[in-house]
Interface confidence: medium
């Protein structure tokens, strides 16, 4: 097929950078992070959307690996679990150095491309991972966090999640609390991408308005195509355009077709819609492979990206637009975030007020002065 051949030609030069893959969660769930378990061999790993041969076949050149700990760890062992998931990403990259190059910058991604390796970055999926601490946030940055999803599917004491918009969560922060605003400023200062997947619309707008740099939605689709509150509404897509930000489309069936069944063409409909409303510069891919139970027909695993690119070419996307969606848009946003960073500026120091800090198993050192 001409378009499939064209897709492969383009992807050899410009492989895909995907915004969100939950393989690290699968490694915890299946093997308790024991990578030396013979069943955990990533060259032969079965039962997952992701393994090394599939990554190669899919022309995956960059991946934000999701460091995720569930919401029920909030105010419990969220930080420990986060550190363990960061550790498993580091160990995975060291164990397969011919495949993965652990990187923390846009320049690192370009280096991985030159070496023919999968640029491997860490995205921390959920603000509860920082336990309402700017010190923990900075420590996670030192350990390689290069995006933070402000919430998962639960509120933090400082930001509201998407379930507020369904009525399943109560709004607490009206988008961002004053401490949440300090988190955003500190992420800007450090040069960490701010990820608005999973957050409420009020949090999306408050953050797009506050951030000194473009932001991303690492795995979200278009609300006008499928009215799931995990997707991005058109008024926010217009803000994405104005701020030169990025929406990386999630492939989960229920966010694509709003039913249990979906197909590749419907994913392309989301990409078309985002391109139409926010512009071609705003489009990317964040498949959420290994993080969702159902994926579209034609996008069964990470090897199938070329088929999606072929469909976009069939729909008259230009080569430049396709290359933007594959990698250039993410690289542009990441570079803008890096340029807006200022590590010489004084860090944010004001802690969250004690009465806003959730959880009952806490000491109060420092607060009682």
């Amino acid at each position: 097929d001409f378009f499939r051949d064209e897709a492969e030609r383009i992807m050899r030069d410009s492989p895909v950078i995907d915004g969100h893959n939950d393989l690290p969660w699968q490694l915890l769930d299946m093997f308790n992070n024991r990578l030396q378990d013979e069943r955990a061999n990533l060259t032969t790993l079965a039962g997952t959307h992701t393994n090394i041969p599939k990554l190669r076949a899919g022309f995956v050149g960059g991946q934000f690996w999701s460091v995720y700990t569930p919401c029920d760890t909030q105010n419990k062992d969220a930080v420990r679990r986060t550190l363990e998931q960061m550790d498993v990403v580091h160990r995975m990259c060291r164990m397969y150095p011919e495949t993965f190059l652990y990187v923390t910058s846009s320049a690192g991604i370009r280096q991985a491309f030159r070496e023919g390796k999968v640029a491997s970055l860490i995205g921390v999926e959920g603000g509860h991972s920082i336990d309402s601490s700017l010190g923990v946030l900075r420590a996670l940055y030192q350990l390689g966090m290069r995006y933070l999803t402000l919430t998962h599917s639960c509120n933090t004491p400082w930001a509201d999640n998407w379930l507020v918009d369904t009525g399943d969560s109560e709004p607490q922060s009206q988008g961002l609390s004053p401490f949440g605003q300090r988190v955003v400023k500190e992420l800007n200062r450090l040069g960490v991408l701010i990820d608005l997947a999973h957050v409420s619309v009020a949090t999306m707008k408050a953050t797009l308005q506050l951030s000194r740099a473009p932001v991303i939605f690492s795995h979200s689709s278009a609300y006008s195509v499928c009215a799931s509150r995990r997707n991005v509404p058109d008024d926010v897509l217009r803000l994405v355009k104005q701020t030169d930000s990025l929406v990386m489309v999630n492939f989960y069936n229920n966010y694509i077709s709003c039913t249990n069944k979906a197909n590749l063409s419907q994913v392309a409909d989301h990409l078309d819609h985002i391109k139409e409303v926010a512009g071609a510069r705003a489009v990317g891919f964040g498949g959420d492979f290994d993080g969702v139970p159902r994926v579209p027909e034609g996008l069964e695993d990470v090897s199938k990206y070329p088929d999606l690119i072929a469909e976009l070419l069939r729909r008259n996307w230009t080569e430049a637009e396709v290359k933007g969606a594959l990698a250039d848009n993410l690289l542009r946003v990441f570079e803008a975030v890096e340029q807006a960073s200022n590590l010489t500026q004084a860090p944010e120091e004001e802690p969250i007020p004690l009465d806003q800090l959730g959880g009952s198993c806490r000491t109060h050192y420092g607060y009682s002065s």
Epitope: Q174, Q209, S211, T243
Partner: nanobody, 129 residues
């Protein structure tokens, strides 16, 4: 918490002038925009004018351009709206509001389109002969 108190409203004849002031509680002016909005009876609230904390960005609704001027005095934490050549259709309750918003956003999108999170109680302006 940001507190906003409007003053300066009143009754004025068409063609006359008024100066509205918005006193803000002390807050870090970095990252703020202050806007004036108005709501006439039976109509939706509309943006009139806004200014960034630095004063570097000012926006006006088309209906007031050339007649209204917004200014800020950061030393006194006040934002003023000078309204000249007033018309009967300017009759409304005028509200002062504050938005947490970065210079980056303002440069891309202006301040009238921001999401304003803090609001005053409003002051009545009536233009009538």
């Amino acid at each position: 918490e940001v507190q906003l108190v409007e003053s300066g409203g009143g009754l004025v004849q068409p063609g006359g002038s008024l100066r509205l002031s918005c006193a803000t509680s002390e807050f870090t002016l970095d990252y703020y925009a202050i806007g004036w909005f108005r709501q006439a009876p039976g109509k939706e609230r509309e943006g009139v004018s806004c200014i960034s904390s630095s004063g570097g960005t000012t926006n006006y609704a088309d209906s007031v351009k050339g007649r209204f001027t917004i200014s800020s005095d950061n030393a006194k934490n006040t934002v003023s709206l000078q309204m000249n050549s007033l018309r009967p259709e300017d009759t409304a309750v005028y509200y002062c509001a504050a938005a947490r918003v970065s210079a980056y956003y303002l440069g891309n999108y202006g301040c009238l389109n921001a999401e304003y999170g803090y609001w005053g109680q409003g002051t009545q302006v009536t233009v009538s002969s």
